[in-house]
Interface confidence: low
């Protein structure tokens, strides 16, 4: 029987390289059995994570799983850096990995790191 | 083995309906989509829709709406698909299609298992 | 919906060249692609997922590339199997639509 947990499904030192200037989403997986619970998004700062409340979001779902996305419309230089989610549910905080953003300025696009999404086998959800 | 074993090849009379069969094995077919697409003769892959054996749930391609209807009985992990009021544009091969889905730094799908494909000919 | 536009449309070429196929989204797909290879009478195979990404299997002369709205898949050294047809699908939200082919045959 799958547990009835919150889980947020962020793989741990996940990365995106991104272009300054482009519309990106960031999706934090997120995992729940009846009610969703109240997620949110906040961008590590040394040993703190700073909450991003005014910033754009939404809800993605699909069977089984939901997303919860930060919008970034578009990319800023200053968007670079490590991400986490955390979703409150029955007064449990329960706190993602962290995300990161490796932003390159369109001024210097050329030297963009090509970075894959993702360089081991994929990890196949229902298969 | 993931296989998708399709039924087997349809003729069938202009104005008519028909039914296609689409059996999955080897994998969770209730929790994991189900594709529908359609191939004629010189043309591209039509995407017609998908179903979610679970509950039931489809969504269509709005040029295949009150064309196709996809239906999946759980209990035997077949998917199906009605094709009505048949012209010879319908004449074609009928393909399911398991849909995966991966994790990488974010969740990308696609389609990763392929039936065997079913020729409905339309013809009087 | 979103459209996707596949270029070219055929392609003639020889044993041991590269080819290289593209498809432009009508909006940011955000990797939300896959490339599929079709053979004549047969079902498709997914050869690319995720854009970049290669399905088991697939030799590595294919490869995928792209973002945003513009994605292309790549063969070097082309070898006989490859001749057939090859589509890219977007999954940015159903309808989830098909490029319209490209035709690689032997020249």
């Known amino acids: 029987k799958e547990s009835c947990d919150v889980q947020l499904y962020i793989k741990r030192q996940s990365e995106h390289s991104i272009l300054a200037g482009d519309p990106f989403e960031l999706e934090c997986p997120v995992k729940y059995c009846a009610n969703r619970p109240h997620v949110t998004w906040c961008k590590l700062n040394g040993t703190t994570c700073v909450k991003l409340e005014d910033r754009q979001t939404s809800w993605k779902e699909e069977k089984n799983i939901s997303f919860f996305i930060l919008h970034f419309e578009p990319v800023l230089p200053n968007d670079n850096g490590s991400y986490r989610c955390s979703a409150n549910f029955q007064s449990n905080l329960i706190e993602s990995h962290s995300t990161t953003l490796y932003v390159t300025d369109v001024k210097s696009a050329s030297e963009r790191p090509s970075k894959d999404e993702m360089a081991s086998r994929p990890w196949l959800l229902y298969r | 083995q993931i296989q998708l074993q399709q039924s087997g090849p349809e003729l069938v009379k202009p104005g008519a309906s028909v039914k296609i069969s689409c059996k999955a094995s080897?994998?969770?077919?209730?929790?994991?989509?189900m594709n529908w697409v359609k191939k004629r003769p010189g043309k591209g892959l039509e995407w017609i829709g998908r179903?979610?054996?679970?509950?039931?749930?489809?969504n269509y391609n709005g040029k295949f709406k009150g064309k196709a209807t996809l239906t999946a009985d759980k209990s035997s992990s077949t998917a199906y698909m009605q094709l009505s009021s048949l012209t010879s544009e319908d004449s074609a091969v009928y393909f399911c299609?398991?849909?995966?889905?991966?994790?990488?730094?974010?969740?990308?799908?696609?389609?990763?298992?392929w039936g065997t494909g079913t020729t409905v000919t339309v013809s009087s | 919906d979103i459209q996707m536009t596949q270029s070219p449309a055929s392609l003639s070429v020889s044993v041991g060249e590269t080819v290289t196929i593209t498809c432009r989204a009508s909006?940011?797909?955000?990797?939300?692609l896959a490339w599929y290879q079709q053979k004549q009478g047969k079902s498709p195979q997914l050869l690319v997922y995720?854009?970049?990404n290669l399905a088991d299997g697939v030799p590595s002369r294919f490869s995928g590339s792209g973002s945003g709205t513009q994605y292309s898949l790549k063969i070097n050294s082309l070898q006989s199997e490859d001749f057939g047809s090859y589509y890219c699908?977007?999954?940015?939200?159903?309808?989830?639509?098909f490029g319209s082919g490209t035709k690689l045959e032997i020249k």
């Open positions: 909006e940011n797909i955000y990797s939300n």
């Open positions: 080897g994998y969770a077919f209730s929790s994991s989509w």
């Open positions: 995720a854009a970049t």
């Open positions: 699908q977007h999954f940015r939200g159903a309808p989830f639509t």
């Open positions: 299609a398991g849909e995966g889905h991966y994790y990488g730094s974010g969740y990308r799908w696609y389609l990763d298992v």
């Open positions: 179903i979610y054996p679970g509950d039931g749930d489809a």
